[in-house]
């Protein structure tokens, strides 16, 4: 009986035990993007660096091609920031003719890819108005949340305009994933 | 054969399992900062509750001298929120001179401080420009990933200017990390 | 002695262990808001899809009337997102009689509600002005931290204005916890 | 109302120590941070510390740093202002007041205590 | 070391208009919480008259207001009254969070 002796009361038998350590895990940092050809309606992917610094992948969690690549089926947080920065919008002209500007935005959208599903799923959307009045800003967007994810699904991070990115520092820009 | 019964298939025989319920744990809130002086181009420091209201750390996790001490080694989410409010920032007079101004802004660190090592790492920044029209304003910028981190390791939160950070409630500004 | 083998040297006898995949979880995510009586100085309570899409609650974390009821006791993450959007606030005038008006605001809290206890605790806040400029706005608030809670807690997002929360899409306005 | 009734004058020697009161009525004492402002006669304010009454947490000005205590009684809604090492210059009227806690401002004001150091 | 400075003194006659400036040292003055402003009547203790550079708390009458532009901060007081004379004291916090006075300005109503 000594093997049973931490097992809660509520423990279904089938529910395994797995040490903590040994779960899918990431954290990807921003590395500057390659010119792509991306079309007109479709957020481009950001690309990662997944072993340099602050980044790393362990656990059977791989990152390729844009893609964190997910191991094993379950219970996954998932979060990203992005920081974008670019030079004052035509919004801040504050009114042309006399009426308002329809506003320029920055997106973030964390996607979720399933080769048996035809269509990406977007988990997570974060977007925001930009309107600003100074010479240049710059402004983070960040995402967390929990998902249910199968053995293959495929992680990416989709911005509405990949120039807007700042990729100069890897704690300003990141991507990452870990099994509950 | 008892023991093993819940040992999933992959489970590694060197990986302890251990409770969730004694892994190191903090969550600190904000406190009104005392007045320090501090150098010209280096990001103060905030210090923290670490035991009234919503505030504590567990589990060997210690708060000490505005740093979070950890105990062991391993993979931990650390977040933080920091909510600033100020007076209109001078960017707000909009064009001086006929052209905009470089625009004040408002940035979160969190910082590893590893014994060894000379040189603090930066884990987490957020930063964004303030341009405001507005008499005052007030936002948050929040912060959260996960790190490999080793024992010993130093964590603490740094701000661009301590005296636009809202001290008034704990659930506005806010550090914590939690052992995956 | 075979059952003891996973157990690191500094694991309490008494703390159970036990699997990660019945412990409690849930994710909501965005419904269109019925119009509901609240009262002046008092944020009204978001209520969620809790089972159609992205959404799940799973191991006895329940969703009812705006409330996810926590069933055991522990520390848990939990999070949201608010997407507010709006048409442009009256601050955007700049200056009305030579001074500057006081800004909207967008405002989200988590809030813990316990039976035996007469107030509701805020345990998170994400409070921003709104002083835009264009002629409509959108952005994000994010808020997430480690709690502990009590079995029977209850938990709610509230808004400082539901007309202007974003429904139209489950990945920008969302709300989640989950036991570590 | 909000009120905020200060302790009587008191006459020190030089080198002594001087614990002034303020007790608070009219509202949740541990809600509101207490300042203490001092004023030598015929000059300006000037600003001592202030004091978390919930926390018992202060933050002093650096020209007070060791020989300024601030401390609360919560039971009796009292805050108390304690300074060591009296000299002639300190001969002042020590003010507490109540601060706005969004934008700092001293809303409320007691009568003050004037502090007389003599040898 | 940040300082707040404010006119000695200044006068008007009853029903003029009378404005007091606070100059600041330091542009970090007031980014946080604004400028304040105080008035001393003689024998009493101060009282707030403006929080934030605009803000009147209740039952302040209108015509003192506040104002900001760049580092300075100004405190006007129109239709002037023989009972505004007294002291007024500029306030605000610095980037080390210290609370700083201005060094008082004395207003003297004349006739």
């Known amino acids: 009986l000594k093997g049973q002796e931490f097992a809660p009361s509520h423990q279904q038998v089938y529910a395994p035990l797995r040490a903590d350590g040994d779960k899918p895990r990431a954290h990807l940092t921003v590395v500057r993007q390659t010119p792509t050809q991306h079309f007109k309606n479709q957020f481009p992917a950001l690309h990662w660096e997944h072993e340099l610094g602050l980044a790393f992948t362990k656990n059977r969690m791989n990152y390729t091609n844009k893609f964190l690549l997910i191991p094993e089926s379950g219970d996954y947080f998932i979060y990203s920031q992005v920081t974008f920065r670019g030079m004052t919008s035509e919004c801040s002209e504050i009114r042309q003719a006399g009426r308002p500007n329809k506003p320029d935005s920055i997106t973030v959208v964390i996607t979720k890819v399933t080769d048996s599903y035809p269509e990406p799923t977007q988990l997570l959307m974060g977007t925001k108005s930009v309107c600003e009045v100074g010479s240049n800003w710059f402004q983070p967007i960040y995402l967390g949340a929990m998902f249910s994810l199968q053995e293959g699904d495929k992680l990416m991070v989709n911005v509405s305009d990949i120039s807007l990115v700042d990729y100069t520092k890897e704690d300003k820009t990141f991507f990452g994933a870990f099994l509950l | 054969l008892k023991g093993q019964e819940f040992a999933p298939s992959h489970q590694q025989v060197y990986a302890p399992l251990r409770a969730d319920g004694d892994k190191p744990r903090a969550h600190l809130t904000v406190v009104r900062q005392t007045p320090t002086q501090h150098f010209k181009n280096q990001f103060p420091a905030l210090h923290w509750e670490h035991e009234l209201g919503l505030a504590f750390t567990k589990n060997r996790m210690n708060y000490t001298n505005k740093f979070l001490l950890i105990p062991e080694s391993g993979d931990y989410f650390i977040y933080s929120q920091v909510t600033f409010r100020g007076m209109t920032s001078e960017c707000s007079e909009i064009r001086q001179a006929g052209r905009p101004n470089k625009p004040d802004s408002i940035t979160v660190v969190i910082t590893k401080v590893t014994d060894s090592y000379p040189e603090p790492t930066q884990l987490l920044m957020g930063t964004k420009s303030v341009c405001e029209v507005g008499s005052n304003w007030f936002q948050p910028i929040y912060l959260g990933a996960m790190f490999s981190l080793q024992e010993g390791d130093k964590l603490m939160v740094n701000v661009s200017d301590i005296s636009l950070v809202d001290y008034t409630k704990e659930d506005k500004t806010f550090f914590g990390a939690f052992l995956l | 002695l075979k059952g003891q083998e996973f157990a690191p040297s500094h694991q309490q006898v008494y703390a159970p262990l036990r699997a990660d995949g019945d412990k409690p979880r849930a994710h909501l995510t965005v419904v269109r808001q019925t119009p509901t009586q609240h009262f002046k100085n008092q944020f009204p309570a978001l209520h969620w899809e809790h089972e159609l899409g992205l959404a799940f609650t799973k191991n006895r974390m329940n969703y009812t009337n705006k409330f996810l009821l926590i069933p055991e006791s522990g520390d848990y993450f939990i999070y949201s997102q608010v997407t507010f959007r709006g048409m442009t606030s009256e601050c955007s005038e700049i200056r009305q009689a030579g001074r500057p008006n006081k800004p909207d605001s967008i405002t989200v809290v988590i809030t813990k509600v316990t039976d035996s206890y007469p107030e509701p605790t805020q345990l998170l806040m994400g409070t921003k002005s709104v002083c835009e400029v264009g002629s409509n706005w959108f952005q994000p608030i994010y808020l997430g931290a480690m709690f502990s809670l009590q079995e029977g807690d209850k938990l709610m997002v509230n808004v400082s204005d539901i007309s202007l929360v974003d429904y139209t899409k489950e990945d920008k306005t969302f709300f989640g916890a989950f036991l570590l | 109302q909000v009120q905020l009734v200060q302790s009587g004058a008191e006459v020190k020697k030089p080198g002594a120590s001087v614990k002034v009161s303020c007790k608070a009525s009219g509202y949740t004492f541990t809600s509101y941070d207490i300042n203490w402002v001092r004023q030598a006669p015929g000059q300006g304010l000037e600003w001592m510390g202030w004091?978390?009454?919930?926390?018992?947490?202060?933050g002093y000005a650096q020209k007070f740093q060791g020989r300024v205590t601030m401390t609360a009684d919560r039971s009796t809604s009292t805050a108390y202002m304690e300074l060591s090492s009296l000299r002639s210059e300190d001969t002042a009227v020590y003010y507490c007041?109540?601060?706005?806690?969004?934008?700092?401002?001293?809303?409320?004001w007691g009568q003050g205590t004037l502090v007389t150091v003599s040898s | 070391q940040s300082v707040l400075t404010q006119p000695p003194s200044v006068s008007g006659a009853p029903g003029q208009r009378v404005t007091i400036s606070c100059t600041s040292s330091?542009?970090?003055?007031?980014?946080?919480?604004?400028v304040h402003w105080y008035q001393q009547l003689p024998g009493t203790a101060p009282k707030l008259l403006i929080e934030?550079?605009?803000n009147r708390p209740s039952g302040v009458p209108d015509r003192f207001s506040g104002s900001k532009s760049g580092t300075s901060a100004s405190l006007t007081i129109t239709g002037l009254l023989p009972e505004d004379e007294g002291d007024y004291y500029c306030q605000s916090w610095d980037g080390t969070l210290s609370a700083l006075f201005g060094g008082g300005t004395k207003l003297t109503v004349l006739g």
């Open positions: 007041a109540r601060e706005v806690p969004e934008t700092a401002a001293f809303e409320y």
């Open positions: 934030g550079y605009y």
């Open positions: 330091s542009s970090d003055i007031g980014a946080g919480q604004g």
């Open positions: 004091l978390n009454p919930n926390s018992g947490y202060t």
